[in-house]
């Protein structure tokens, strides 16, 4: 099981001193956002028990494996469900703590109930403040059952759940009808996926017989040990005030684990620390009792004394849970509770024993989970013990499980079970990812998803040119860093594969799938220079350039021209896709703009050095529109136009241009120049009779200006069809005289 503990500090007189701490004993726990160690998460779960919103809780990380939640301002902030999530990948585990208000109408006799599949669970809510009304039971926030207030038994409301199944697991609550939900008794029911003493997919495997209140995990058969106990079967007590799978953590504060609730991964749930009991874990065990919640009885024999933290302390000459075993009986010594090997390895396992008479090589045997017995190949005899060494045949996955070392002498026998985990070396499921490439190097991310078991100790990157039969080059890298493959050939495809390893002998996995990564072309090295440029209009620029003469073929695919408009902070890029080109026309530029211009050679996606920049000023655009354009029919073929000169002219007008179009006509408009810029009137002749025309005009200085407003006018009468409009211009006064 994942080594994850959620600690609740139950000093309830002052909610501001209340805190929850989640502690992980996992290697690399909580390291953060990389794929090798997701962070610890600690939060209040408001999906089932909703409390009034308050100020946000404060989360503080203390190193890589601890996170603390504080900032509770009032007792109601504490009521409800809290969860801590830790562990990586398939081992990601959620630990849940349920907090009850000590002032609630109903209080749970026991908060966490762990039962086996098919058992009957009984939840008991004790009346703390009586109300003469129905009691509503809920499961995961939804209605479940109702009891009449007369149905209380000895001041308790009982909910019987016969033949429970795993889906029955969850948060249960008992509430008086019309009472605040915060006054409810909250419970946590954990239903193991198997019957008592069984585990595994079909519940076919036998649990190791967890001691000291440990609970057998229905998925992996491991004992989840109560706080303060360790070992494969929870057979060993930690020193007072310590907890964690290896007793590596220490309770904070001078009073040790007093006032702390410990929550562990399911199917354990929550309890007080070893040596403490009561709803707030502040009462020491009564004489003769020990362990978490003081649930265990010592029953020491042969003069043993009861320690409320560890159980029986045996006098010299005796050992065993109840001091029932004489030291003359052989005893397995210092056997590791858990060993880990890689698949298909052939490890050596040692088992040491002592006793009177002294154990010899033949009296120590090793039993595999399938019942196969291995005899030791050699033994080392020392004054105080005999160590037998066993050569294990090639390991298969079925060898995972509980192995047993057994010693038998005429003085008796002893055995010690230990867990063997056969791990599958990791195999990448995907190819490495190309991050960036250059002509002679590739930057690769080796982090890929994998099958098999972690943690990843080393990553090897194998690479060689595509279709090559030469040996693979190999680089060993840190799992969390990107790799740069250097000294490669330009414009060459390389086959790249990842190989992952986990700790231990035989931990190297098979190579992952290959991927093709291609180095970039050689960088173009020639620097062009600008020969010249000339303006072909207010928005058009012709540019020419040259390249130095060098022997051999030109390394380049084309040219990139860049125009930088510093005023507007805009860059215009023009791609010339022929490496032979030495001139280009740039159009659609902004009139009156000062540009910085340069040119550079490109090859594939790589740019060569830019030419020294040139500075170009485009002429401004044309003048503003003429004002107050007016049309007046003079005859059946003539219309007179009058206007006023544009305002704020940047220079002298060179001419006006009139646009003539038949209203609603589909043909192209006709443009007529008025070459005498001082004029403010002109007559358009040769128009058709009784025809409606549209007119607009613009002035020209260096370039054409903006169009005026459009005016409409119809010719008079019904004269002959004209050949087409022509223009005659006069001073306005002269036209009026006529």
């Amino acid at each position: 099981a994942v080594d994850l503990t959620l600690l609740a500090n139950l000093r309830l007189t002052d909610p501001q001193r209340f805190f929850l701490t989640c502690v992980s004993g996992e290697a690399g726990a909580g390291r953060g956002s990389d794929a090798w160690g997701p962070p610890l998460l600690l939060e209040k779960d408001d999906r089932i028990v909703r409390t009034p919103p308050g100020p946000p809780l404060r989360l503080a990380r203390n190193g890589s494996h601890q996170v603390t939640l504080r900032g509770f301002s009032k007792p109601s902030d504490l009521v409800g469900v809290f969860s801590c999530v830790g562990g990586a990948g398939a081992r990601r585990t959620r630990v849940i703590y349920v907090h009850n208000s000590p002032g609630a109408h109903l209080l749970p006799d026991k908060v966490t109930h762990t039962v086996n599949k098919g058992d009957t669970a009984v939840l008991s809510a004790r009346v703390h403040k009586e109300k003469q009304t129905d009691v509503i039971w809920k499961s995961n926030g939804s209605y479940f059952y109702t009891l009449d207030w007369h149905e209380a038994q000895d001041g308790r409301f009982l909910l019987q759940l016969p033949n429970v199944q795993p889906p029955s697991s969850g948060i249960y609550s008992a509430t008086y009808l019309e009472a605040s939900p915060l006054g409810s008794a909250f419970f946590r029911l954990i239903v193991r996926g198997c019957g008592a003493g069984r585990w595994g997919p079909g519940c076919t495997k036998e649990c190791p017989g967890c001691l000291h209140g440990g609970v057998c995990h229905d998925h992996d058969g491991e004992c989840v040990c109560p706080p303060g106990f360790t070992g494969t079967r929870c057979e060993q007590a930690c020193r007072e005030g310590r907890f964690g799978q290896s007793c590596q953590e220490q309770c904070p504060g001078i009073s040790g684990c007093r006032g702390l609730t410990f929550c562990l991964p399911d199917p354990y749930g929550c309890s007080c620390g070893s040596g403490w009991r009561g709803s707030q874990c502040q009462e020491a065990c009564a004489p003769g009792h020990f362990g978490a919640d003081c649930r265990l009885q010592c029953q020491c024999q042969n003069g043993g004394t009861c320690d409320r933290f560890s159980g029986c302390v045996c006098p010299s000459g005796w050992h065993g849970v109840h001091c029932e075993k004489s030291d003359r009986i052989p005893q397995i010594l210092n056997m590791a509770s858990e060993l880990e090997f890689n698949l298909e390895t052939m490890p050596r396992i040692n088992c040491a024993a002592a006793g009177n008479p002294f154990p010899v090589r033949g009296s120590i045997e090793l039993r595999k989970p399938d019942g196969t017995v291995l005899l030791s190949t050699k033994a080392i005899v020392e004054p105080e013990k005999t160590t037998a060494e066993f050569e294990v045949p090639r390991l298969v996955l079925a060898d995972s499980g509980f192995w047993e070392c057994r010693v038998s002498t005429s003085g008796g026998q002893d055995s010690r079970r230990f867990k063997v985990n056969v791990k599958v070396p990791p195999v990448p499921l995907a190819a490495p990812r190309l991050l960036t490439k250059q002509s002679r190097q590739l930057v690769v991310s080796p982090l890929v998803s994998f099958s098999g078991d972690g943690p990843i100790s080393t990553v090897r990157l194998h690479y060689r040119p595509q279709d090559s039969t030469m040996d693979w080059s190999t680089i060993v890298v840190d799992p969390s860093e990107n790799v740069t493959l250097m000294n490669l050939r330009p414009k060459t495809g390389y086959s790249v594969r990842v190989q992952l390893s986990r700790p231990g002998e035989g931990g190297e996995g098979a190579w992952g799938p290959p991927t093709l990564m291609t180095t970039d072309c050689p960088e173009p090295l020639l620097q062009p220079w600008l020969e010249g440029w000339h303006v072909e209009g207010t928005d058009r620029l012709r540019v020419s350039w040259s390249l130095p003469l060098v022997p051999g073929p030109l390394v380049g695919d084309g040219f990139l021209l860049r125009l930088w408009d510093g005023t507007r902070g805009q860059e215009r890029r023009e791609n010339v896709s022929s490496p032979q080109a030495r001139t280009a026309l740039l159009t659609g530029l902004t009139p009156g703009t000062h540009y910085q211009l340069d040119v550079q050679l490109y090859h594939c996606t790589l740019l060569g050095p830019a030419s020294p920049p040139a500075h170009v000023l485009l002429p401004p655009s044309g003048p503003p529109a003429p004002r107050h354009l007016h049309a007046q029919a003079l005859s059946d073929s003539e219309i007179q136009l009058t206007w006023k000169h544009p305002e704020a002219l940047p220079g002298p007008i060179s001419k006006y241009v009139v646009e003539v179009q038949v209203a609603g006509g589909a043909g192209d408009p006709l443009w007529i120049d008025v070459d005498r810029p001082e004029e403010t009137s002109t007559i358009i002749r040769g128009l058709n009779a009784s025809t409606r025309y549209l007119f607009r005009m613009r002035a020209s200085i260096q370039g054409l200006g903006d169009w005026s407003n459009t005016v409409e006018e119809s010719t008079l009468g019904n004269g002959l069809q004209a050949e087409g409009p022509v223009q005659e211009s006069r001073a306005a006064e002269e036209g009026l005289d006529q």
Partner: antibody, heavy 119, light 107 residues
């Protein structure tokens, strides 16, 4: 589909007996308070009796106390009303109703069964 | 026993009208009151529970309110399908008691 189906109604003489049944489906019958409500022809609704999920606690209207008995068989998902010493004023449509989870509104009703007490 | 006095016993209104039915309890019953709708020849159906709570699937034009022991049931904009008899019911004390009912018709 959540459903209640009453049966057992009919014509009975004053002083006679009748047993009504109500078959429940579509929900966990054994978890809910159940009740009987009646409605005399052309009149309003009158609550008759209720029974808690365990069957251990029952309540009755004064007008039927001592004559009617409510019971349930959770293994058969069935509610019963045993009516003895029937009177003409017991003539009504009898509805079986579920009392909603956590509240006391009758959230599911049967279609009703007619009981006529007449000589 | 708690008496529930419902008024009026019948009322006629036009489509789109705002309709209000009242119910008075003889004792304090807190919010422990439900409103039911019964259409002719059908079983009753709960519309509002706990004096205010609109049941799932009930149109939002229905609402309930309370002032002391006086409860009101309102239909904001009467629709033809709202023709029915409406009952209030207290569940504060056993025996649970219903009002006499209000028969609602369309003009």
């Amino acid at each position: 589909e959540v459903q209640l189906l009453e049966s057992g109604g009919g014509l009975v003489q004053p002083g006679g007996s009748l047993r009504l049944s109500c078959a429940a489906s579509g929900f966990t019958f054994s978890h809910y308070i159940m009740a009987w409500v009646r409605q005399a022809p052309g009149k309003g609704l009158e609550w008759v009796s209720r029974i808690y999920p365990s069957g251990g606690k029952t309540y009755y209207a004064d007008s039927v106390k001592g004559r009617f008995t409510i019971s349930r068989d959770n293994s058969k998902n069935t509610l019963y009303l045993q009516m003895n010493s029937l009177r003409a004023e017991d003539t009504a449509v009898y509805y079986c109703a579920r009392q909603g989870g956590g509240g006391r509104a009758f959230d599911i009703w049967g279609q009703g069964t007619m009981v006529t007490v007449s000589s | 026993d708690i008496q529930m006095t419902q008024s009026p016993s019948s009322l006629s209104a036009s489509v789109g009208d705002r309709v209000t039915i009242a119910c008075r309890a003889s004792h304090d019953i807190s919010d422990n009151l439900n409103w039911y709708q019964q259409k002719p020849g059908r079983a009753p159906k709960v519309v509002i529970s706990d004096a205010f709570n609109l049941e799932a699937g009930v149109p939002s034009r229905f609402s309930g309110s309370r002032s002391g022991t006086y409860f009101t049931f309102t239909i904001n904009s009467l629709q033809p399908e709202d023709v029915a008899t409406y009952y209030c019911q207290q569940f504060n004390n056993v025996p649970y008691t219903f009002g006499q009912g209000t028969k609602l018709e369309i003009k």
